[in-house]
């Protein structure tokens, strides 16, 4: 069977006027997962995103991440899209005073 991922979006200061947003998927099985950023619903090009490898997390499941750098103040235009074992979901960037957003998918 499949185990759906826990998806967590975080933000961190990158440089003046920019922030790095990171979308992490964890505790999923099997290992094939789509994780990518969108701006205004349009997929970002590969060359503007950085991906972590899909790695075992020690519990028989996997974890990975994707990150991109965006302009501060434009967070609401960006979403992380996840697709795994026939299920999909989108995840917004948390506002500046809330650093974590996570959800487990069934």
């Amino acid at each position: 069977g499949s185990v759906p991922p826990m998806v967590n979006v975080t933000r961190s200061e990158a440089s003046e006027g920019n922030i790095t947003v990171t979308c992490r998927a964890s505790s999923f099985y099997p290992r094939n997962i789509t994780l990518t950023w969108r701006q205004d619903g349009v997929s970002l090009s590969h060359d503007t995103q950085q991906w972590g490898d899909v790695l075992p997390d020690g519990n028989g499941t996997y974890q990975t991440w994707v990150a991109t750098r965006i302009c501060q103040g434009e967070e609401q235009r960006f979403t992380c899209y996840m697709e795994h074992s026939g299920n999909h979901s989108t995840h917004p960037v948390p506002s500046g005073n809330s650093h974590h957003h996570h959800h487990h998918h069934h």
């Epitope: 997929s43 090009s45 590969h46 060359d47």
Partner: antibody, heavy 120, light 107 residues
Framework: QVQLKESGPGLVAPSQSLSITCTVS????????VNWVRQPPGQGLEWLGM???????DYNSALKSRLSISKDNSKSQVFLKMNSLQTDDTARYYC??????????????WGAGTTVTVSS | DIQMTQTTFSLSASLGDRVTISCSAS??????LNWYQQRPDGTVKLLIY???TLPSGVPSRFSGSGSGTDYSLTISNLEPEDIASYYC?????????FGGGTKVEIK
């Protein structure tokens, strides 16, 4: 076994619209993206656009104003509609499943294609 | 858009030969490159993805390499079923773009 099969009108008059259906089997459209690619006679391949598992679409900006991609998950069908056809839209039109895993994005299974001729 | 150039439109080789097909991008594409095979009947098949990874079922005589803007596909031991056109495709930037193709024929 993953399969995709295109069906189209064959002949379209100039300025008219084109509708092609891609019927898939062996996988669910809710969990995979489907791409459209075309190939004019004697030329290379051109990516037109794609529809993701959640129904979101990405288009080739050069054709975006004339293109629409949609789907019916329950019928396992993806639809390509292109408006205002001209003779240089004559091509073989393919649908292909997209696999998008981190740094890897590729079209792993293709349909046989359907030939569309734009002529009066 | 990123332009993909395959300078050799067609090449003739003998069965058993080692064949190399080149592809260059108009800018660096960070190994975001795939290769496809199109048979004479129009059937298209994924041959190599992410520069050098072979999908299951693709014979090991096919290999890919490259970096930056320059990439290549090598067939180490040409067989009759390899007679086809070969296309490179980048996905570093949207839209994904293909090279013009290289047709491999038997000498």
């Amino acid at each position: 076994q993953v399969q995709l099969k295109e069906s189209g009108p064959g002949l379209v008059a100039p300025s008219q619209s084109l509708s092609i259906t891609c019927t898939v089997s062996g996988f669910s459209l809710t969990g995979s993206g489907v791409n459209w690619v075309r190939q004019p006679p004697g030329q290379g391949l051109e990516w037109l656009g794609m529809i993701w598992g959640d129904g979101n679409t990405d288009y080739n900006s050069a054709l975006k104003s004339r293109l629409s991609i949609s789907k019916d998950n329950s019928k396992s069908q993806v639809f390509l509609k292109m408006n205002s056809l001209q003779t240089d839209d004559t091509a073989r039109y393919y649908c292909a499943r997209g696999a998008h895993y981190g740094k890897r994005w590729y079209f792993d299974v293709w349909g046989a294609g359907t030939t569309v001729t734009v002529s009066s | 858009d990123i332009q993909m150039t395959q300078t050799t439109f067609s090449l003739s080789a003998s069965l058993g030969d080692r064949v190399t097909i080149s592809c260059s991008a108009s800018q660096g594409i960070n190994n975001y490159l795939n290769w496809y095979q199109q048979r004479p009947d129009g059937t298209v098949k994924l041959l190599i993805y992410y520069t050098s990874t072979l999908p299951s079922g693709v014979p090991s005589r096919f290999s890919g390499s490259g970096s930056g803007t320059d990439y290549s596909l090598t067939i180490s031991n040409l067989e009759p079923e390899d007679i086809a056109s070969y296309y490179c495709q980048q996905y570093s930037k949207l839209p994904p773009t293909f090279g013009g193709g290289t047709k491999v024929e038997i000498k």
